[in-house]
Protein backbone atom coordinates (compact mmCIF):
# COMPACT_ATOMS: atom_id res chain seq x y z
CA UNK A 1 0.00 0.00 0.00
CA UNK A 2 3.37 2.67 -0.30
CA UNK A 3 2.54 3.44 3.76
CA UNK A 4 6.38 3.86 5.44
CA UNK A 5 5.62 1.99 8.79
CA UNK A 6 7.39 3.62 11.65
CA UNK A 7 7.20 1.70 14.93
CA UNK A 8 6.57 3.91 18.51
CA UNK A 9 7.47 2.55 22.15
CA UNK A 10 5.10 0.59 23.71
CA UNK A 11 2.43 2.69 26.29
CA UNK A 12 1.30 0.94 29.45
CA UNK A 13 -2.03 1.84 30.85
CA UNK A 14 -4.33 1.75 33.33
CA UNK A 15 -8.18 -0.25 32.78
CA UNK A 16 -11.88 2.24 33.90
CA UNK A 17 -10.18 5.42 32.83
CA UNK A 18 -10.15 8.17 30.00
CA UNK A 19 -7.08 7.66 27.62
CA UNK A 20 -5.86 9.66 24.08
CA UNK A 21 -2.87 9.74 22.00
CA UNK A 22 -2.18 11.80 19.72
CA UNK A 23 -1.35 10.88 15.81
CA UNK A 24 1.65 13.48 15.62
CA UNK A 25 4.91 13.06 13.62
CA UNK A 26 6.22 16.24 13.09
CA UNK A 27 7.24 17.21 10.30
CA UNK A 28 4.47 14.45 8.60
CA UNK A 29 1.80 16.04 10.13
CA UNK A 30 2.72 19.59 9.87
CA UNK A 31 1.41 20.19 6.20
CA UNK A 32 -2.10 19.13 5.02
CA UNK A 33 -2.39 16.04 5.89
CA UNK A 34 -5.80 13.19 5.90
CA UNK A 35 -5.06 10.94 9.56
CA UNK A 36 -7.22 7.79 10.33
CA UNK A 37 -6.92 5.24 13.24
CA UNK A 38 -7.09 1.57 12.77
CA UNK A 39 -6.93 -1.24 15.86
CA UNK A 40 -4.85 -4.39 15.08
CA UNK A 41 -4.47 -4.01 11.40
CA UNK A 42 -8.14 -4.27 10.31
CA UNK A 43 -9.17 -2.46 7.44
CA UNK A 44 -12.32 -0.85 9.45
CA UNK A 45 -11.23 2.29 10.88
CA UNK A 46 -11.70 3.47 14.03
CA UNK A 47 -15.19 5.31 14.70
CA UNK A 48 -15.67 9.15 14.13
CA UNK A 49 -18.96 8.94 15.86
CA UNK A 50 -18.25 11.25 19.70
CA UNK A 51 -20.47 8.70 21.47
CA UNK A 52 -18.69 5.67 20.70
CA UNK A 53 -16.65 4.24 23.66
CA UNK A 54 -13.55 4.46 21.47
CA UNK A 55 -13.54 6.88 18.45
CA UNK A 56 -10.94 9.31 16.77
CA UNK A 57 -11.41 13.03 17.59
CA UNK A 58 -9.67 15.17 14.78
CA UNK A 59 -6.00 13.38 15.17
CA UNK A 60 -6.40 11.43 18.59
CA UNK A 61 -7.52 8.29 19.10
CA UNK A 62 -9.94 8.76 22.75
CA UNK A 63 -11.06 5.96 25.08
CA UNK A 64 -13.45 6.83 27.30
CA UNK A 65 -12.84 5.18 29.64
CA UNK A 66 -9.83 2.69 28.41
CA UNK A 67 -10.96 -1.14 28.82
CA UNK A 68 -8.67 -4.22 29.72
CA UNK A 69 -9.55 -5.74 26.30
CA UNK A 70 -8.50 -2.75 24.60
CA UNK A 71 -4.80 -4.00 24.90
CA UNK A 72 -3.25 -4.44 21.55
CA UNK A 73 -1.37 -2.22 18.31
CA UNK A 74 -3.22 0.82 17.40
CA UNK A 75 -2.43 2.21 13.72
CA UNK A 76 -2.45 5.47 12.31
CA UNK A 77 -2.05 6.04 8.97
CA UNK A 78 -1.27 9.66 7.83
CA UNK A 79 -1.28 10.29 4.28
CA UNK A 80 -0.35 13.63 2.71
CA UNK A 81 -0.57 14.70 -0.67
CA UNK A 82 2.48 12.79 -1.90
CA UNK A 83 3.14 10.03 1.15
CA UNK A 84 1.73 7.66 3.38
CA UNK A 85 3.00 7.13 6.83
CA UNK A 86 1.73 3.95 8.99
CA UNK A 87 2.64 4.61 13.13
CA UNK A 88 2.45 1.44 14.88
CA UNK A 89 1.57 2.22 19.03
CA UNK A 90 1.36 -0.40 21.11
CA UNK A 91 -1.20 -0.08 24.18
CA UNK A 92 -1.14 -2.36 27.12
CA UNK A 93 -4.09 -2.00 29.64
CA UNK A 94 -3.74 -3.10 33.07
CA UNK A 95 -6.22 -3.08 36.00
CA UNK A 96 -4.20 -0.78 38.63
CA UNK A 97 -5.44 0.12 41.79
CA UNK A 98 -2.99 2.44 43.03
CA UNK A 99 -3.69 2.17 46.86
CA UNK A 100 -3.18 -1.18 46.64
CA UNK A 101 -0.21 -2.40 45.40
CA UNK A 102 3.16 -0.25 44.93
CA UNK A 103 3.58 1.15 40.73
CA UNK A 104 7.14 0.05 41.76
CA UNK A 105 6.39 -3.64 40.52
CA UNK A 106 5.72 -2.00 37.26
CA UNK A 107 9.40 -1.56 35.51
CA UNK A 108 8.34 -0.66 31.86
CA UNK A 109 5.94 2.08 33.07
CA UNK A 110 5.95 5.34 31.00
CA UNK A 111 9.00 8.01 32.14
CA UNK A 112 6.07 10.38 32.54
CA UNK A 113 5.12 8.00 35.45
CA UNK A 114 8.51 8.34 36.79
CA UNK A 115 10.35 11.51 38.15
CA UNK A 116 12.78 12.58 40.34
CA UNK A 117 12.81 15.46 42.92
CA UNK A 118 16.16 17.14 43.74
CA UNK A 119 17.23 17.11 47.59
CA UNK A 120 17.01 20.76 49.38
CA UNK A 121 16.37 22.69 45.98
CA UNK A 122 12.22 24.07 44.96
CA UNK A 123 11.25 21.34 42.40
CA UNK A 124 8.00 20.26 40.56
CA UNK A 125 5.94 17.23 39.69
CA UNK A 126 4.00 17.26 36.38
CA UNK A 127 0.55 15.16 35.84
CA UNK A 128 1.12 14.80 32.44
CA UNK A 129 -2.93 15.08 31.43
CA UNK A 130 -2.97 14.56 27.00
CA UNK A 131 -6.59 14.92 25.50
CA UNK A 132 -8.07 16.67 22.61
CA UNK A 133 -9.64 20.13 22.64
CA UNK A 134 -13.25 18.33 23.44
CA UNK A 135 -11.74 16.97 26.70
CA UNK A 136 -12.30 19.59 29.41
CA UNK A 137 -10.31 19.03 32.36
CA UNK A 138 -11.13 20.28 36.03
CA UNK A 139 -8.57 21.29 38.45
CA UNK A 140 -5.79 18.50 39.63
CA UNK A 141 -6.00 17.15 43.13
CA UNK A 142 -2.18 15.64 44.33
CA UNK A 143 -2.18 12.71 46.63
CA UNK A 144 0.80 10.96 48.34
CA UNK A 145 0.52 7.27 49.38
CA UNK A 146 -3.41 7.81 48.90
CA UNK A 147 -4.00 10.51 51.03
CA UNK A 148 -4.68 14.27 49.56
CA UNK A 149 -1.29 16.54 49.87
CA UNK A 150 -1.74 19.48 52.40
CA UNK A 151 1.29 21.54 53.82
CA UNK A 152 2.79 25.00 52.84
CA UNK A 153 5.45 23.06 51.22
CA UNK A 154 3.27 22.06 48.22
CA UNK A 155 1.59 24.34 45.97
CA UNK A 156 -1.22 23.43 42.67
CA UNK A 157 0.37 25.70 39.76
CA UNK A 158 -2.12 24.22 36.61
CA UNK A 159 -0.74 20.51 35.80
CA UNK A 160 2.22 21.03 38.28
CA UNK A 161 2.62 20.33 41.79
CA UNK A 162 5.40 22.68 43.07
CA UNK A 163 7.65 21.09 46.05
CA UNK A 164 9.83 23.54 48.16
CA UNK A 165 12.64 22.37 50.23
CA UNK A 166 12.14 18.64 49.29
CA UNK A 167 13.26 15.98 51.86
CA UNK A 168 14.36 12.69 51.78
CA UNK A 169 10.93 11.88 52.60
CA UNK A 170 9.16 13.14 49.49
CA UNK A 171 10.53 10.00 47.54
CA UNK A 172 7.44 7.78 47.36
CA UNK A 173 4.33 6.98 45.39
CA UNK A 174 2.22 10.16 43.93
CA UNK A 175 -0.94 10.00 42.20
CA UNK A 176 -2.60 13.07 40.45
CA UNK A 177 -6.11 13.16 39.88
CA UNK A 178 -8.50 14.90 37.59
CA UNK A 179 -12.07 15.34 36.17
CA UNK A 180 -12.28 14.95 32.81
CA UNK A 181 -15.68 16.17 30.74
CA UNK A 182 -16.50 14.83 27.25
CA UNK A 183 -19.76 15.49 25.83
CA UNK A 184 -21.24 16.20 29.01
CA UNK A 185 -20.20 12.86 30.90
CA UNK A 186 -17.37 13.19 33.42
CA UNK A 187 -14.37 10.81 34.20
CA UNK A 188 -11.83 10.26 36.87
CA UNK A 189 -8.08 10.54 35.27
CA UNK A 190 -5.89 9.17 37.79
CA UNK A 191 -1.94 9.14 36.83
CA UNK A 192 0.13 7.11 39.72
CA UNK A 193 3.55 8.98 39.61
CA UNK A 194 6.84 7.14 41.76
CA UNK A 195 8.79 9.99 42.75
CA UNK A 196 12.43 9.56 43.63
CA UNK A 197 14.91 11.87 44.81
CA UNK A 198 18.61 12.87 43.87
CA UNK A 199 21.11 15.03 45.48
CA UNK A 200 22.73 15.63 41.75
CA UNK A 201 22.15 19.21 40.48
CA UNK A 202 21.51 17.43 37.38
CA UNK A 203 21.95 20.89 35.18
CA UNK A 204 25.62 20.96 36.26
CA UNK A 205 24.42 24.28 38.43
CA UNK A 206 23.76 26.71 35.50
CA UNK A 207 21.91 29.57 35.34
CA UNK A 208 18.75 30.13 33.56
CA UNK A 209 18.58 32.44 31.11
CA UNK A 210 15.67 34.94 30.83
CA UNK A 211 15.24 35.99 27.28
CA UNK A 212 11.82 38.21 28.00
CA UNK A 213 11.20 40.66 29.73
CA UNK A 214 14.24 42.45 30.33
CA UNK A 215 13.64 44.50 33.51
CA UNK A 216 11.34 47.20 31.48
CA UNK A 217 7.84 49.06 31.67
CA UNK A 218 5.32 48.54 28.62
CA UNK A 219 2.94 51.13 27.98
CA UNK A 220 -1.08 49.86 27.95
CA UNK A 221 -3.96 51.65 28.03
CA UNK A 222 -6.52 51.68 31.59
CA UNK A 223 -9.38 48.32 30.62
CA UNK A 224 -7.36 46.52 28.07
CA UNK A 225 -6.58 43.16 27.92
CA UNK A 226 -2.07 42.21 27.83
CA UNK A 227 -0.89 39.33 27.47
CA UNK A 228 2.87 39.23 28.13
CA UNK A 229 5.38 35.89 27.84
CA UNK A 230 8.05 35.09 29.34
CA UNK A 231 10.93 33.23 27.54
CA UNK A 232 13.53 31.21 29.34
CA UNK A 233 16.71 29.32 27.88
CA UNK A 234 17.65 26.57 30.27
CA UNK A 235 19.38 23.43 30.11
CA UNK A 236 17.49 20.10 29.30
CA UNK A 237 18.15 18.63 32.83
CA UNK A 238 16.99 21.08 34.61
CA UNK A 239 15.01 21.42 37.69
CA UNK A 240 13.84 24.93 38.14
CA UNK A 241 10.10 26.23 38.54
CA UNK A 242 9.05 29.06 36.13
CA UNK A 243 6.06 30.80 37.21
CA UNK A 244 4.77 34.44 37.67
CA UNK A 245 4.51 36.49 41.24
CA UNK A 246 3.31 39.62 41.92
CA UNK A 247 4.53 40.98 45.90
CA UNK A 248 6.55 37.88 46.29
CA UNK A 249 2.83 35.47 45.70
CA UNK A 250 2.24 33.39 42.86
CA UNK A 251 -0.22 35.48 40.56
CA UNK A 252 -2.40 32.82 40.69
CA UNK A 253 -3.09 33.44 44.16
CA UNK A 254 -2.63 36.65 44.73
CA UNK A 255 -5.71 36.99 42.25
CA UNK A 256 -7.40 33.54 43.33
CA UNK A 257 -10.73 35.39 44.06
CA UNK A 258 -11.04 37.52 40.89
CA UNK A 259 -8.89 35.67 38.74
CA UNK A 260 -8.25 38.44 36.52
CA UNK A 261 -4.61 38.08 36.08
CA UNK A 262 -3.59 34.72 35.69
CA UNK A 263 -0.67 32.44 34.25
CA UNK A 264 -0.66 30.31 31.30
CA UNK A 265 0.16 26.92 30.71
CA UNK A 266 3.85 26.58 30.23
CA UNK A 267 5.06 25.47 26.49
CA UNK A 268 8.63 24.37 25.75
CA UNK A 269 10.25 23.85 22.47
CA UNK A 270 13.24 21.38 22.28
CA UNK A 271 16.54 22.11 21.17
CA UNK A 272 19.64 19.98 20.82
CA UNK A 273 21.70 21.47 24.19
CA UNK A 274 18.84 23.32 25.81
CA UNK A 275 15.30 24.26 26.27
CA UNK A 276 13.21 27.28 25.64
CA UNK A 277 10.73 27.84 27.81
CA UNK A 278 6.98 30.07 27.88
CA UNK A 279 4.88 30.71 30.24
CA UNK A 280 2.72 33.77 29.98
CA UNK A 281 1.02 36.31 32.23
CA UNK A 282 -2.55 37.28 30.96
CA UNK A 283 -4.24 40.68 31.98
CA UNK A 284 -8.06 40.13 31.77
CA UNK A 285 -8.56 43.94 31.94
CA UNK A 286 -5.64 46.17 32.76
CA UNK A 287 -6.71 48.18 36.08
CA UNK A 288 -5.47 51.49 37.94
CA UNK A 289 -3.64 49.22 40.44
CA UNK A 290 -1.65 47.02 38.31
CA UNK A 291 0.55 50.60 37.28
CA UNK A 292 4.05 50.79 38.98
CA UNK A 293 3.67 47.36 40.08
CA UNK A 294 6.69 44.66 39.48
CA UNK A 295 5.34 41.23 37.87
CA UNK A 296 8.13 39.46 38.24
CA UNK A 297 8.75 35.97 35.86
CA UNK A 298 10.80 34.04 38.01
CA UNK A 299 13.00 30.54 36.81
CA UNK A 300 14.81 29.18 39.28
CA UNK A 301 17.41 31.71 40.70
CA UNK A 302 16.59 34.26 38.00
CA UNK A 303 14.09 36.76 37.82
CA UNK A 304 13.13 39.48 35.66
CA UNK A 305 10.07 41.93 35.87
CA UNK A 306 7.78 44.05 33.95
CA UNK A 307 6.02 47.32 35.05
CA UNK A 308 3.04 48.40 33.46
CA UNK A 309 2.79 51.89 32.68
CA UNK A 310 -0.39 54.80 31.32
CA UNK A 311 0.78 55.69 27.98
CA UNK A 312 1.94 59.53 27.89
CA UNK A 313 -0.53 61.78 26.37
CA UNK A 314 -0.71 62.79 23.36
CA UNK A 315 -1.45 66.29 22.61
CA UNK A 316 -1.74 66.24 18.93
CA UNK B 1 14.89 -7.11 38.07
CA UNK B 2 17.58 -4.78 36.50
CA UNK B 3 20.74 -6.06 35.30
CA UNK B 4 23.76 -3.91 34.12
CA UNK B 5 26.26 -6.13 31.72
CA UNK B 6 29.94 -3.88 30.81
CA UNK B 7 31.63 -5.53 27.52
CA UNK B 8 34.39 -4.22 25.48
CA UNK B 9 38.17 -4.95 25.07
CA UNK B 10 40.10 -6.11 28.31
CA UNK B 11 43.65 -4.67 26.55
CA UNK B 12 44.17 -1.37 25.35
CA UNK B 13 47.48 0.19 24.29
CA UNK B 14 49.02 3.71 25.98
CA UNK B 15 47.66 6.60 24.09
CA UNK B 16 44.84 4.85 22.54
CA UNK B 17 40.59 5.19 23.73
CA UNK B 18 39.57 2.39 26.01
CA UNK B 19 35.53 2.23 25.07
CA UNK B 20 33.11 0.22 27.20
CA UNK B 21 29.18 -0.03 26.47
CA UNK B 22 26.97 -1.23 29.69
CA UNK B 23 23.42 -2.82 28.07
CA UNK B 24 20.92 -2.23 30.83
CA UNK B 25 17.96 -4.70 31.10
CA UNK B 26 14.88 -4.53 33.34
CA UNK B 27 15.06 -0.73 33.41
CA UNK B 28 14.69 1.69 30.35
CA UNK B 29 17.90 4.35 30.47
CA UNK B 30 15.45 7.25 29.89
CA UNK B 31 14.71 6.74 33.36
CA UNK B 32 17.64 7.56 36.06
CA UNK B 33 21.10 7.90 36.20
CA UNK B 34 23.45 5.89 34.61
CA UNK B 35 26.94 6.03 36.21
CA UNK B 36 30.68 4.60 35.82
CA UNK B 37 32.67 4.05 38.35
CA UNK B 38 36.25 2.22 38.46
CA UNK B 39 38.61 0.23 40.71
CA UNK B 40 42.39 1.12 40.65
CA UNK B 41 44.03 -2.69 41.49
CA UNK B 42 44.90 -2.65 45.01
CA UNK B 43 43.33 0.98 45.38
CA UNK B 44 39.95 2.75 46.05
CA UNK B 45 36.89 3.15 44.15
CA UNK B 46 36.97 6.11 42.08
CA UNK B 47 33.28 8.09 40.27
CA UNK B 48 33.62 8.49 36.23
CA UNK B 49 30.69 10.44 35.62
CA UNK B 50 27.28 9.61 34.59
CA UNK B 51 24.77 10.22 31.84
CA UNK B 52 20.98 11.33 33.57
CA UNK B 53 17.60 10.49 31.96
CA UNK B 54 17.74 13.24 29.57
CA UNK B 55 21.05 12.30 28.00
CA UNK B 56 22.48 15.20 30.10
CA UNK B 57 26.68 13.81 30.92
CA UNK B 58 28.66 14.74 34.50
CA UNK B 59 32.13 14.14 34.53
CA UNK B 60 34.65 13.99 37.42
CA UNK B 61 36.76 16.89 36.96
CA UNK B 62 40.08 15.05 37.06
CA UNK B 63 38.84 13.17 34.18
CA UNK B 64 36.74 15.43 32.12
CA UNK B 65 38.85 16.01 29.48
CA UNK B 66 39.61 12.88 27.89
CA UNK B 67 35.75 11.02 29.06
CA UNK B 68 33.29 10.97 26.79
CA UNK B 69 29.77 9.16 28.34
CA UNK B 70 27.22 8.92 25.75
CA UNK B 71 23.99 6.13 24.85
CA UNK B 72 21.57 4.12 22.33
CA UNK B 73 18.13 4.46 23.94
CA UNK B 74 17.49 2.05 20.78
CA UNK B 75 19.77 -0.59 21.93
CA UNK B 76 18.96 0.30 25.68
CA UNK B 77 22.97 0.65 26.29
CA UNK B 78 25.40 3.51 27.36
CA UNK B 79 29.00 3.99 26.97
CA UNK B 80 32.26 4.79 28.17
CA UNK B 81 35.19 6.11 26.07
CA UNK B 82 38.19 7.08 27.62
CA UNK B 83 40.87 8.46 25.29
CA UNK B 84 44.78 8.70 25.80
CA UNK B 85 45.27 6.09 27.83
CA UNK B 86 48.00 5.62 30.08
CA UNK B 87 48.52 2.51 32.99
CA UNK B 88 47.37 4.70 35.29
CA UNK B 89 43.75 4.01 33.81
CA UNK B 90 44.45 0.26 34.54
CA UNK B 91 41.36 -0.80 36.66
CA UNK B 92 38.02 -2.52 37.16
CA UNK B 93 35.75 -0.71 35.30
CA UNK B 94 32.06 -0.85 36.33
CA UNK B 95 28.79 0.57 35.31
CA UNK B 96 25.86 1.13 38.11
CA UNK B 97 22.19 2.65 38.70
CA UNK B 98 20.49 3.94 41.49
CA UNK B 99 16.27 3.52 42.45
CA UNK B 100 16.69 1.49 45.13
CA UNK B 101 13.91 2.57 47.72
CA UNK B 102 13.31 5.82 45.38
CA UNK B 103 16.70 7.41 45.60
CA UNK B 104 18.58 7.67 42.82
CA UNK B 105 21.77 8.34 44.27
CA UNK B 106 21.72 4.80 45.90
CA UNK B 107 23.65 2.23 43.61
CA UNK B 108 22.04 -0.41 44.41
CA UNK B 109 22.58 -2.53 40.29
CA UNK B 110 26.10 -2.82 39.44
CA UNK B 111 27.89 -4.91 36.35
CA UNK B 112 29.64 -7.46 37.26
CA UNK B 113 32.70 -5.11 36.19
CA UNK B 114 35.56 -5.86 33.69
CA UNK B 115 39.16 -5.51 33.95
CA UNK B 116 41.22 -2.97 31.64
CA UNK B 117 44.52 -3.51 31.22
CA UNK B 118 46.49 -0.37 29.56
CA UNK B 119 50.07 -1.64 28.07
CA UNK B 120 51.67 -2.32 25.25
CA UNK C 1 36.32 18.81 45.90
CA UNK C 2 34.94 17.40 49.11
CA UNK C 3 37.27 14.51 50.17
CA UNK C 4 36.42 11.62 52.37
CA UNK C 5 38.76 10.45 54.89
CA UNK C 6 37.70 6.84 56.22
CA UNK C 7 39.24 5.62 59.53
CA UNK C 8 41.34 3.34 59.86
CA UNK C 9 42.63 2.15 56.97
CA UNK C 10 42.15 -1.26 57.91
CA UNK C 11 41.31 -3.23 60.83
CA UNK C 12 41.84 -6.88 62.49
CA UNK C 13 39.16 -7.75 64.92
CA UNK C 14 37.57 -10.93 65.67
CA UNK C 15 34.19 -12.03 65.51
CA UNK C 16 31.76 -10.86 67.59
CA UNK C 17 33.16 -7.63 68.04
CA UNK C 18 31.99 -4.24 68.10
CA UNK C 19 33.72 -2.35 65.12
CA UNK C 20 33.01 1.23 64.01
CA UNK C 21 34.09 2.78 60.71
CA UNK C 22 34.56 6.48 60.52
CA UNK C 23 34.29 8.60 57.61
CA UNK C 24 34.87 11.87 57.82
CA UNK C 25 34.43 14.94 54.75
CA UNK C 26 36.14 18.13 54.79
CA UNK C 27 32.84 19.92 53.58
CA UNK C 28 29.29 19.44 54.94
CA UNK C 29 27.28 16.60 53.35
CA UNK C 30 23.64 15.82 53.26
CA UNK C 31 23.85 12.30 53.17
CA UNK C 32 26.02 8.91 53.35
CA UNK C 33 26.35 6.03 51.39
CA UNK C 34 28.03 2.94 52.52
CA UNK C 35 29.38 -0.04 49.88
CA UNK C 36 30.35 -3.37 51.11
CA UNK C 37 33.04 -5.30 48.40
CA UNK C 38 34.45 -8.69 48.12
CA UNK C 39 37.33 -9.17 46.42
CA UNK C 40 36.91 -9.71 43.04
CA UNK C 41 33.46 -8.83 43.11
CA UNK C 42 31.07 -5.83 42.50
CA UNK C 43 30.41 -3.52 45.38
CA UNK C 44 27.30 -3.42 47.23
CA UNK C 45 24.64 -1.11 47.97
CA UNK C 46 25.47 -1.48 52.27
CA UNK C 47 23.39 1.72 53.52
CA UNK C 48 21.91 4.20 51.92
CA UNK C 49 20.63 8.00 53.25
CA UNK C 50 23.42 8.09 56.12
CA UNK C 51 20.86 5.36 58.14
CA UNK C 52 18.95 3.39 56.09
CA UNK C 53 19.86 -0.12 55.25
CA UNK C 54 20.09 -1.99 51.95
CA UNK C 55 18.04 -5.17 51.09
CA UNK C 56 19.20 -8.40 52.76
CA UNK C 57 22.08 -6.34 54.88
CA UNK C 58 21.87 -7.75 58.49
CA UNK C 59 20.25 -5.37 60.93
CA UNK C 60 23.68 -5.44 63.08
CA UNK C 61 25.10 -2.71 61.04
CA UNK C 62 23.91 0.49 61.90
CA UNK C 63 24.87 4.26 60.00
CA UNK C 64 24.96 7.14 61.64
CA UNK C 65 26.40 10.46 61.21
CA UNK C 66 25.94 14.29 59.77
CA UNK C 67 27.33 17.32 58.42
CA UNK C 68 31.09 15.90 58.33
CA UNK C 69 31.49 12.82 60.48
CA UNK C 70 29.28 9.85 59.36
CA UNK C 71 29.83 5.99 61.15
CA UNK C 72 29.09 2.85 60.04
CA UNK C 73 28.50 0.02 63.24
CA UNK C 74 28.64 -3.77 63.18
CA UNK C 75 27.44 -4.66 66.52
CA UNK C 76 28.80 -8.22 66.97
CA UNK C 77 31.06 -9.11 63.31
CA UNK C 78 30.10 -12.15 62.00
CA UNK C 79 32.46 -14.09 59.34
CA UNK C 80 30.46 -12.93 56.32
CA UNK C 81 31.55 -9.43 56.95
CA UNK C 82 35.01 -9.41 56.83
CA UNK C 83 35.17 -7.07 53.42
CA UNK C 84 36.13 -3.69 52.40
CA UNK C 85 33.87 -0.53 53.36
CA UNK C 86 33.56 2.52 51.27
CA UNK C 87 31.50 5.61 52.09
CA UNK C 88 30.51 7.92 49.19
CA UNK C 89 28.75 11.40 49.23
CA UNK C 90 26.47 12.64 46.39
CA UNK C 91 25.79 16.18 48.14
CA UNK C 92 28.40 18.33 45.62
CA UNK C 93 30.37 16.78 42.78
CA UNK C 94 32.72 15.46 42.30
CA UNK C 95 30.99 12.73 43.97
CA UNK C 96 33.78 10.80 45.64
CA UNK C 97 34.69 7.87 47.47
CA UNK C 98 36.38 7.15 50.73
CA UNK C 99 39.70 5.52 50.19
CA UNK C 100 38.41 2.37 52.28
CA UNK C 101 38.48 0.24 55.32
CA UNK C 102 39.64 -3.60 55.05
CA UNK C 103 38.30 -5.11 58.05
CA UNK C 104 40.22 -8.51 58.27
CA UNK C 105 39.96 -10.98 60.73
CA UNK C 106 42.86 -11.37 63.70
Known amino acids: DGCKDIFMKNEILSASQPFAFNCTFPPITSGEVSVTWYKNSSKIPVSKIIQSRIHQDETWILFLPMEWGDSGVYQCVIKGRDSCHRIHVNLTVFEKHWCDTSIGGLPNLSDEYKQILHLGKDDSLTCHLHFPKSCVLGPIKWYKDCNEIKGERFTVLETRLLVSNVSAEDRGNYACQAILTHSGKQYEVLNGITVSITERAGYGGSVPKIIYPKNHSIEVQLGTTLIVDCNVTDTKDNTNLRCWRVNNTLVDDYYDESKRIREGVETHVSFREHNLYTVNITFLEVKMEDYGLPFMCHAGVSTAYIILQLPAPDFR | QVQLQESGPGLVKPSQTLSLTCTVS??????GYWNWIRNHPGKGLEYI?????????YYNPSLKSRVTISRDTSKNQFSLKLSSVTAADTAVYYC??????????????WGQGTLVTVSS | DIQMTQSPSSLSASVGDRVTITCRAS?????MYWYQQKPGKAPKLWIY???NLASGVPSRFSGSGSGTSYTLTISSLQPEDFATYYCQQFTTSPYTFGQGTKLEIK
Open chain 2, 49 to 57: GYISYSGYT
Open chain 3, 49 to 51: LTS
Open chain 2, 96 to 109: ATGGYDYVEDALYY
Open chain 3, 27 to 31: SNVRY
Open chain 2, 26 to 31: GASITS
